[in-house]
């Protein structure tokens, strides 16, 4: 008996071939001997089966001795043994229809779980293997689960169902809803404007939800909500916003926040959360602000940084075009009685300069000038 695998919702064509290459009488029946369709001369006739409105044949092939049964919009319950009667012969074809669906939605938040469920006919024992867009293979039976979805899991998942040495392939498009970056650090000199951007890693036609930025200033003992906003069809409207700092938010996507100036009291880290309509859970992006200040008070030249810096970062004070006078893995360095000239304060990571502030030290009889 020939086995054919079909996909729920698809169309299948079951073949039946006579030895004579001409149009002769044929019938297709199901395992209960109920007629599905056949012919009377050049006319297609249909029987009382449940497939009535979904069954068809190709009249153009009858003259060649081919009498296919075409079943449209396949259902799991169409799984059956179909019998073609032609020339006093019976050809049996076993049709097995499978369906593969994602748990609730194909748009899932980063960190959520994806469950793929296989619908299969009674008596079948299929195996399933799925390949994610990043090449990860998962195997299972009736259900397959992937926990902690990552951004790289966005795209087309290809799943192969194997039964009786035959296979059928499903393709499911999964969209992982996330920000492009999980975390970012902005390095600024005191007084500079600060821009925070929160680009999304997905595009949907209508994006509605609400968000909030919580900020933990380094010198504060608790975090504060700096801004709350609504998102309606990709348009941003601010509900409540702090005035210290005078935070501003762009009205369109990508989500964009501006601090008019970087100040030590604002240095710290923030967490922007976005709750999307009809989704449980929230998207998160962390932002960090590091602020540098170089000052000269009397005979002391000081350079300080505030905010979340890694212990391996180096803070240095050097006279332009000279070796560093002081270089430490600390958040403040100073030079007593600095000589006149343009001094540079540098925050660097393995030799790469992340932040630089220049301060001009004048001869001792005059006051310092900050460029």
């Amino acid at each position: 008996k020939k086995v054919v695998l079909g996909k729920k919702g698809d169309t299948v064509e079951l073949t039946c071939t006579a030895s004579q290459k001409k149009s002769i009488q044929f019938h297709w029946k199901n395992s209960n001997q109920i007629k599905i369709l056949g012919n009377q001369g050049s006319f297609l006739t249909k029987g009382p089966s449940k497939l009535n409105d979904r069954a068809d044949s190709r009249r153009s092939l009858w003259d060649q001795g081919n009498f296919p049964l075409i079943i449209k919009n396949l259902k799991i319950e169409d799984s059956d043994t179909y019998i073609c009667e032609v020339e006093d012969q019976k050809e049996e074809v076993q049709l097995l229809v499978f369906g593969l669906t994602a748990n609730s939605d194909t748009h899932l938040l980063q960190g959520q779980s994806l469950t793929l469920t296989l619908e299969s006919p009674p008596g079948s024992s299929p195996s399933v293997q799925c390949r994610s867009p990043r090449g990860k293979n998962i195997q299972g039976g009736k259900t397959l689960s992937v926990s902690q979805l990552e951004l790289q899991d966005s795209g087309t998942w290809t799943c192969t169902v194997l039964q009786n040495q035959k296979k059928v392939e499903f393709k499911i498009d999964i969209v992982v809803l996330a920000f492009q970056k999980a975390s970012s650090i902005v390095y600024k000199k005191e007084g500079e404007q600060v821009e925070f951007s929160f680009p999304l890693a997905f595009t949907v036609e209508k994006l509605t939800g609400s968000g909030e930025l919580w900020w933990q200033a380094e010198r504060a003992s608790s975090s504060k909500s700096w801004i709350t906003f609504d998102l309606k069809n990709k348009e941003v409207s601010v509900k409540r916003v702090t005035q210290d700092p005078k935070l501003q938010m762009g009205k369109k996507l990508p989500l964009h926040l501006t601090l008019p100036q970087a100040l030590p009291q604002y240095a710290g880290s923030g967490n922007l959360t976005l709750a999307l309509e009809a989704k449980t859970g929230k998207l998160h992006q962390e932002v960090n602000l590091v602020v540098m200040r170089a000052t000269q008070l009397q005979k002391n030249l000081t350079c300080e940084v505030w905010g979340p810096t890694s212990p391996k970062l180096m803070l240095s004070l050097k006279l332009e075009n000279k070796e560093a006078k002081v270089s430490k893995r600390e958040k403040a360095v100073w030079v007593l009685n600095p000589e006149a000239g343009m001094w540079q304060c540098l925050l660097s990571d393995s030799g790469q300069v992340l932040l630089e502030s220049n301060i001009k030290v004048l001869p001792t009889w005059s006051t310092p000038v900050q460029p």
Epitope: A217, A220, S221, S222, K224, V241, T242, Q243, Q265
Partner: nanobody, 130 residues
Framework: EVQLVESGGGSVQPGGSLRLSCGAS????????IGWFRQAPGKEREGVSC????????YYADSVKGRFTISRDNAKNTVYLQMNSLKPEDTAVYYC???????????????????????WGEGTLVTVSS
Amino acid sequence: EVQLVESGGGSVQPGGSLRLSCGASGFDVDYYAIGWFRQAPGKEREGVSCIASSDGSTYYADSVKGRFTISRDNAKNTVYLQMNSLKPEDTAVYYCAADATCPYYCSGSVCYLETGMDYWGEGTLVTVSS
């Protein structure tokens, strides 16, 4: 250790003036934002005024605008609240508090001072009555 001590409270007649002081120890007053808050008997604590660190921006509750003035003396490590044209409804315990930033927020065109700050003083009583 961060400590805040309020002084200058007392009794005054309507229309009178008082100057409250907030002395800080354990930190420099220009390092933190300092706010003044008040709580009248049987009422919730409310924001009065706040002065930001570094640039010294000032914020006031609508109910005290034009009557109260906040200022800072870095040398004395003290923040002041000058209260003029006092009204009976100004009667309350006045607290000073410190944080990295002033909890001054706007919703549309309505702006207000919230009470969320990190460090608090014990308070000083101001009574306005004839």
